[in-house]
Interface confidence: low
């Protein structure tokens, strides 16, 4: 899957473009918008009725190293007592993200640009029923 | 990948930071990916706190299209169908990792930016303050 | 702005016990908080433990496994590293930081506390 070119005509590439190899491209991993503040309602992955729980990834290799990860913690969802209830499903909800991974060959590095599929939380469905002829 | 002579000895590489800068092959590595949500899942219907997904879209950004997720309710749908407010439907927020064409429209030249994106919804007990 | 602060570090001997604290203050720590390390002559930081608010420990490096686990008091705005049988590979400058989502950086980091352990 290639990054597609920009196709539209007002978008000409500028003088200003820094030289590139072909076949690559040039990748400033700082990061914008580092510090920019999220505002989460408190405790959700407890609070759900499809709760989850994290856990973190690490690999050196990968910017970022960290990846974070929810596992439901139910096949089921929690009802108003409290209990698992089995007819109602708690599934995964996902979002892809970009990480660059650096691989090396021999006494060499590169680095090739990565989307991972991250879970970020877990939600409550009713199931599909699939019925028998 | 775009191949970068090491230093002579050949360090052990664990040790050494990502630089600030790096060529990277065009090919994301990928396989199975789908971006469009209303494709890959119908989740957005079937839950109980269910959502609208709306397309956000920047030509100047890999990738151009993000979907982001609107809860429909502020309760969440009961066994009956019906909305219950003693419940809420929430939006599940991921901080995700993007590409920034910088300097802008250069087509080869990228910084990474973090967004802050509505995944989806989830239904949640409410907090309840209870005033003295 | 927040900013953390380590404490707790010195100097002891292989198979001893040691606790380091770190506390935020003009803030409170994020969703997660974890304990990093860098050992003399690295230049690069190691994941040691990363905690999550509501206390569940969600890494653990493998080579500190067993030995060392991590604890938060939101009330005090306060994290712990518990380390227990430390070993001269453990002889590092410690780091405590913060962040909503490890997955695309720690947003604050104190300034680090040194442990040494000697045999």
């Known amino acids: 899957r290639k990054i597609p070119k920009v196709g539209h005509t007002f978008f000409q590439k500028p003088e200003s473009c820094p030289p590139v190899p072909g076949g690559s491209m040039k990748l400033d991993i700082g990061i914008i918008n580092e510090n920019q503040r999220v505002s989460m309602s408190r405790n959700i992955e407890s609070r759900s009725t499809s709760p989850w729980n994290y856990t973190v990834t690490w690999d050196p290799n990968r910017y970022p190293s960290e990846v974070v990860q929810a596992q439901c913690r139910n096949l089921g969802c929690i009802n108003a007592q409290g209990k698992e209830d089995i007819s109602m499903n708690s599934v995964p909800i996902q979002q892809e993200t970009l990480v660059v991974r650096r691989k090396h060959q021999g006494c060499s590095v590169s680095f090739q640009l990565e989307k991972v599929l991250v879970t970020v939380g877990c939600t409550c469905v009713t199931p599909v029923i699939h019925h028998v002829q | 990948g775009i191949t970068i002579p090491r230093n002579p000895g050949c360090p052990n590489s664990e040790d050494k930071n990502f630089p600030r800068t790096v060529m990277v092959n065009l090919n994301i590595h990928n396989r199975n990916t789908n971006t469009n949500p209303k494709r890959s899942s119908d989740y957005y219907n079937r839950s109980t706190s269910p959502w609208n997904l709306h397309r956000n879209e920047d030509p100047e950004r890999y990738p151009s299209v993000i979907w982001e997720a609107k809860c429909r309710h502020l309760g969440c749908i009961n066994a009956d169908g019906n909305v219950d407010y003693h419940m809420n439907s929430v939006p599940i927020q991921q901080e995700i990792l993007v590409l920034r064409r910088e300097p802008p429209h250069c087509p080869n030249s990228f910084r990474l930016e973090k967004i802050l994106v509505s995944v989806g919804c989830t239904c949640v007990t409410p907090i309840v303050h209870h005033v003295a | 702005e927040v900013q953390l602060v380590e404490s707790g570090g010195g100097k002891v001997q292989a198979g001893d016990s040691l606790t380091l604290s770190c506390v935020a203050s003009g803030g409170t720590f994020s969703n997660y908080a974890a304990w990093f390390r860098q050992a003399p002559g690295k230049d690069r930081r190691e994941l040691v433990v990363s905690i999550f608010r509501t206390g569940s420990i969600t890494y653990t490096a493998d080579s500190v496994k067993g030995r060392f686990t991590a604890s938060r008091v939101n009330t005090k705005n306060t994290v712990y590293l518990q380390m227990n049988s430390l070993k001269p590979e453990d002889t590092a400058v410690y780091y405590c930081?913060?962040?909503?989502?490890?997955?695309?950086?720690?947003?604050?980091w104190g300034q680090g506390t040194q442990v040494t352990v000697s045999s």
């Open positions: 930081a913060s962040a909503y989502n490890p997955g695309v950086g720690y947003d604050y």
